[in-house]
């Protein structure tokens, strides 16, 4: 049985490595992948409160 890629990581893992442009950090397996491989939360309806903060998931600027 294949172990989950995150099984051996501790709570104090270092911050995610910056991804190259057009790559996003996959928080579930802790590495950079093409952004198109990840599915982001559904966008909030117009006028919804509290926009989601920027995270390491998004491409580096």
């Amino acid at each position: 049985m294949r172990r989950g890629p995150r099984s051996l990581r501790g709570r104090d893992a270092p911050a995610p490595t910056p991804c190259v442009p057009a790559a996003c950090f996959d928080l579930l397996v802790r590495h950079c992948v093409a952004c198109g491989l990840l599915r982001t939360p559904r966008p909030k309806p117009a006028g919804a409160s509290s926009p989601a903060p920027r995270t390491a998931l998004q491409p580096q600027e």
Epitope: R2, G4, P5, R6, S7, R9, R11, A13, A15, P16, D26, L27, L28, V29, V33, G36, L37, L38, R39, T40, P41, R42, T55, A56, L57
Partner: antibody, heavy 117, light 111 residues
Framework: EVQLQESGPSLVKPSQTLSLTCSVT????????WNWIRKFPGNKLEFMGY???????YYNPSLKSRISITRDTSKNQYYLQLNSVTTEDTATYYC???????????WGQGTTLTVSA | DIVLTQSPVSLAVSLGQRATISCRAS??????????MHWYQQKPGQPPKLLIY???DLESGIPARFSGSGSGTDFTLTINPVETDDVAIYYC?????????FGGGTKLEIK
């Protein structure tokens, strides 16, 4: 809108193998994560495992070596195989897909499995 | 495994009042400044429905009566005001560490 639909037997005998299919529409299983979750009669939910965009699998250690999750990208389906079932595997089985934080925002309706001789 | 303990197991609240459900994790579910804690509602014969993700973010289409708070090991789901349609079982879930785990559920009833 992503839609998931489970299919498979409703009754399996002890020691047999359970095989379930999750058919996905509205998105490709070559992106994201594709999970199996089950709910036992006492209302406990258990995460069983996933297969992700790259075909990488993760299995809950509680299921030991009994579980296998595979996929057929040409059919946009993924599959659960659970070997050597017992009455303890009686549950409602769901397929679901999470977004980037692991929160599962799309679920199938579930298929109820009874393991009985 | 991270164990999630929900309390109370069942809760009866009057219409229009506040319902508060607690979820305590056996270890922190925070990483990268994110709380990997989510809340679901499940009604009989239906799959769970995502209400809150990342501890406090309201899922699209969920009414603002639902809110989440907390970080580290202690999290709270609040429903205010409670409506008849809220009768269900509520679950917390963590995705910080494998295997992902769920709380035991809290059954909400109307008093």
């Amino acid at each position: 809108e992503v839609q998931l639909q489970e299919s498979g037997p409703s009754l399996v005998k002890p020691s047999q193998t359970l095989s379930l299919t999750c058919s996905v529409t509205g998105d490709s299983i070559t992106r994201g994560y594709w999970n199996w979750i089950r709910k036992f009669p006492g209302n406990k939910l258990e995460f069983m495992g996933y297969i992700n965009y790259s075909g990488t699998t993760y299995y809950n250690p509680s299921l030991k070596s009994r579980i296998s999750i595979t996929r057929d990208t040409s059919k946009n389906q993924y599959y659960l195989q659970l070997n050597s079932v017992t009455t303890e595997d009686t549950a409602t089985y769901y397929c679901a897909t999470p977004h980037t934080y692991g929160a599962m925002d799309y679920w199938g309706q579930g298929t109820t499995l009874t393991v009985s001789a | 495994d991270i164990v999630l303990t929900q309390s109370p197991v069942s809760l009866a609240v009057s219409l229009g009042q506040r319902a508060t459900i607690s979820c305590r994790a056996s270890e922190s579910v925070d990483d990268y400044g994110i709380s990997f804690m989510h809340w679901y509602q499940q009604k009989p014969g239906q799959p769970p429905k995502l209400l809150i993700y990342r501890a406090s973010d309201l899922e699209s289409g969920i009414p603002a009566r639902f809110s989440g708070s907390g970080s580290g090991t202690d999290f709270t789901l609040t429903i205010n005001p409670v409506e008849t349609d809220d009768v269900a079982i509520y679950y917390c879930q963590q995705t910080s560490k494998d295997p992902w785990t769920f709380g035991g559920g809290t059954k909400l009833e109307i008093k």
